[in-house]
């Protein structure tokens, strides 16, 4: 059998096969988070679980001080999902009292940050407006979605309240990246 | 051209290079469910269409009785959408007559079962407090992420309530995983 | 090396080895949006950028007039979320006024033109009742599922009402799809 | 309704090791934040530490070079061992559950009276 | 350290009664504030969480409220089965860890 055999009529030269079991990935998971106070406009990043539970990170893909390194350039499948949960927003009755209707939100951003490059990208970004009129609610926010990123390149989630994050269970609230 | 060109740098040898079109992939979508009568605490399986329409399997991966049967160890992404719908939630009027105010709520897991593991591993879980003030409402429920398998794993869509589940169109309820 | 080795048990012959990095792949995101007159039932499609910002298109998938075009057979993992905002649904008013209480509703489908089919396929749909008590609301929805698609197939992303989709942020509306 | 129930000797000489389990009955296990609390003899509360399903823990840092907390999935019990125990260790010794609100306990065992005594 | 100071740290009281216990921290702990009751020879009860949301099964008459560095809990009628002590307890430190008030005994007058 010719290694020609393997190549289909449109193979690149420089796109050298590569085994799918190498490939970078992780799948990370919600552990407590840190309190922190955070700027305004500026949303607080999670911190993850990384090796127990079905945590992992694989193939040179690393996880470190809220980042997952990149540590190869190529396309991305990235994903999260965060579940909050809260107390009744303030929504209805601010309605009923004729006050300024701007509804509470939770919102999940997917930042990248390169070094070389001063601001961090937001690559993905869910948001909701919560209205509820329910003592106690809950509900996910699922993103993902493909990327082109470097070697070097570094990702985080950031939230819009952490207090609000649900951080009992590990199928709830996590963070996922792949090479395809 | 030789073999080794193919091979990046950092190619584990243990690792051989597969042809993309022969890993184990499936596409379930919805169908009428069976009312179950299930124990308090344990959400009722889900069965689904697998070859007619959109759905199909493919390269040995096999669905059998609610379960898709995991046929080769590796690093899979799974996916489910679960599309409920239902009459107006008590929670509004609950909360008006000062009774105790638990909202109710949907959630879809995606479960692992292990044979030689006693306790089904709960992989996903999407939940979300219901509380509407509209007579009927609809909403889906998505989610996704990777996981390191083993053969013969089983995995299975588990619901909060089986009869609040839209089963009128294959594109609003589904299931599936491949091998990455 | 032999070529031989790179074949695992279970390899096709006609399944041929192909590098990762020239598959076709696509992730367009939102613009802002041309008004359309759309038939009861016929929902508008999106248009989209695909070179700008985090878009791209690669390896032969091209973007055109709303439609991402299939390069190839095979199977895709196709994905889009869409964010809807508006302002208050009519719903609790209806509902009060004891007219019928249909609610409002946000509906995203990612479609599927075969030129030699009559009709278009509904791959996915994400639908969701809309009955805000807050003035301004906000919500995405996500989808995301694998499908075999052929050469000359294509995809476009349709919703319910255009003027309802936030076109503001590349990160909160997008669309894309990659050959597995 | 869930309910803990612990078990472990009550009576140490110094520099031994207090050995605690505490099983969970009736309910969720890995849905939790799982903690130990103890109050000596009329004093106040103090945290000593707290695990989840998966094993990752953490501990008040003024205990953290003596505690161990480890967590058994499969019998839904966790455990606290304390090490080079002194006569100030000597306290009531209660598990309890994290509702998932920040460390606020919701499910409390009935407490187990340590004694370190020569 | 967050420090966590609870006045008074004893209060005589009459069944009827307005009753009201406050918690000072040493830096903004934002809501990260928590009320427990404990009666002798028994485990602590969770009152409120979140500085001011009513644990299930807790009467009404009790309230918290505050956020920042000041709390409050509030019996607004005391009933004979209030005599008890009262702990705040805060969440915010990092690392992640808790510690409780010393405690305000609240006796029958």
């Known amino acids: 059998l010719k290694g020609q055999e393997f190549a289909p009529s449109h193979q690149q030269v420089y796109a050298p096969l590569r085994a799918d079991g190498d490939k970078p990935r992780a799948h990370l998971t919600v552990v407590r988070q840190t309190p922190t106070q955070h700027f305004k406009n500026q949303f607080p990043a999670l911190h993850w679980e990384h090796e127990l539970g079905l945590a992992f990170t694989k193939n040179r893909m690393n996880y470190t001080n809220k980042f997952l390194l990149i540590p190869e350039s190529g396309d991305y499948f990235i994903y999260s999902q965060v579940t909050f949960r809260g107390m009744t927003s303030e929504c209805s009755e601010i309605r009923q009292a004729g006050r300024p209707n701007k509804p509470d939100s939770i919102t999940v951003v997917i930042t990248k940050v390169t070094d070389s490059y001063p601001e961090p990208t937001q690559l993905l970004m869910g948001t909701k407006s919560v209205c509820e009129v329910g003592s106690n609610w809950f509900q996910p926010i699922y993103l993902g979605a493909m990327f082109s990123l470097q070697e070097g390149d570094k990702l985080m989630v950031n939230v819009s309240d952490i207090s609000l994050v649900d951080y009992t269970k590990e199928d709830k609230t996590f963070f996922g990246a792949f090479l395809l | 051209l030789k073999g080794q060109e193919f091979a990046p740098s950092h190619q584990q040898v243990y690792a051989p290079l597969r042809a993309d079109g022969d890993k184990p992939r499936a596409h379930l979508t919805v169908v009428r469910q069976t009312p179950t009568q299930h124990f308090k605490n344990q959400f009722p399986a889900l069965h689904w269409e697998h070859e007619l329409g959109l759905a199909f399997t493919k390269n040995r991966m096999n669905y059998t009785n609610k379960f898709l049967l995991i046929p080769e160890s590796g690093d899979y992404f799974i996916y489910s959408q679960v599309t409920f719908r239902g009459m107006t939630s008590e929670c509004s009027e609950i909360r008006q007559a000062g009774r105790p105010n638990k909202p109710d709520s949907i959630t879809v897991v995606i479960t692992k079962v292990t044979d030689s593991y006693p306790e089904p591993t709960q992989l996903l879980m999407g939940t979300k407090s219901v509380c509407e003030v509209g007579s009927n409402w609809f909403q889906p429920i998505y989610l996704g992420a990777m996981f390191s398998l083993q053969e013969g794993d089983k995995l299975m869509v588990n619901v909060s309530d089986i009869s609040l589940v839209d089963y009128t169109k294959e594109d609003k309820t589904f299931f599936g995983a491949f091998l990455l | 090396l032999k070529g031989q080795e790179f074949a695992p048990s279970h390899q096709q012959v006609y399944a041929p080895l192909r590098a990762d990095g020239d598959k076709p792949r696509a992730h367009l995101t939102v613009v802002r949006q041309t008004p359309t007159q759309h038939f009861k039932n016929q929902f508008p499609a999106l248009h989209w950028e695909h070179e700008l910002g985090l878009a791209f298109t690669k390896n032969r998938m091209n973007y055109t007039n709303k439609f991402l075009l299939i390069p190839e057979s095979g199977d895709y993992f196709i994905y889009s979320q869409v964010t809807f905002r508006g302002m208050t649904s009519e719903c609790s008013e209806i509902r009060q006024a004891g007219r019928p209480n249909k609610p409002d509703s946000i509906t995203v489908v990612i479609t599927k033109v075969t030129d030699s089919y009559p009709e278009p396929t509904q791959l996915l749909m994400g639908t969701k009742s809309v009955c805000e008590v807050g003035s301004n609301w906000f919500q995405p929805i996500y989808l995301g599922a694998m499908f075999s698609l052929q050469e000359g197939d294509k995809l476009m992303v349709n919703v319910s009402d255009i003027s309802l989709v936030d076109y503001t942020k590349e990160d909160k509306t997008f669309f894309g799809a990659f050959l597995l | 309704q869930e309910q803990l129930q612990q078990w472990g000797a009550g009576l140490l000489k110094p520099s031994e090791t207090l050995s605690l389990t505490c099983a969970v009955y009736?309910?969720?296990?890995?849905?939790y934040y799982w903690s130990w609390i103890r109050q000596p003899p009329g004093k106040g509360l103090e945290w000593i530490g707290e695990i989840n399903h998966s094993g990752r823990t953490n501990y008040n840092p003024s205990l953290k070079s003596r505690v161990t907390i480890s967590v058994d999935t499969s019998k839904n019990q966790f455990s606290l061992k304390l090490s080079s125990v002194t006569a100030a260790d000597t306290a009531v010794y209660y598990c309890?559950?994290?509702?998932?609100?920040?460390?606020?306990?919701?499910?409390w065992d009935q407490g187990t009276m340590v004694t370190v005594s020569s | 350290d967050i420090q966590m100071t609870q006045s008074p740290s004893s209060l005589s009281a009459s069944v009827g009664d307005r009753v009201t216990i406050t918690c000072r921290a040493s830096q903004s702990i934002s809501s990260y504030l928590n009320w427990y009751q404990q009666k002798p020879g028994k485990a602590p009860k969770l009152l409120i969480y979140v500085a001011s949301s009513l644990q299930s099964g807790v009467p009404s008459r009790f309230s918290g409220s505050g956020s920042g560095t000041d709390f409050t809990l509030t019996i607004s009628s005391l009933q004979p089965e209030d005599f008890a002590t009262y702990y705040c307890q805060q969440s915010y430190s990092n690392p992640q860890e808790c510690s409780f008030g010393q405690g305000t005994k609240l006796e029958i007058k």
């Open positions: 309890a559950r994290d509702s998932g609100w920040h460390f606020s306990f919701d499910i």
């Open positions: 009736g309910g969720s296990f890995s849905g």
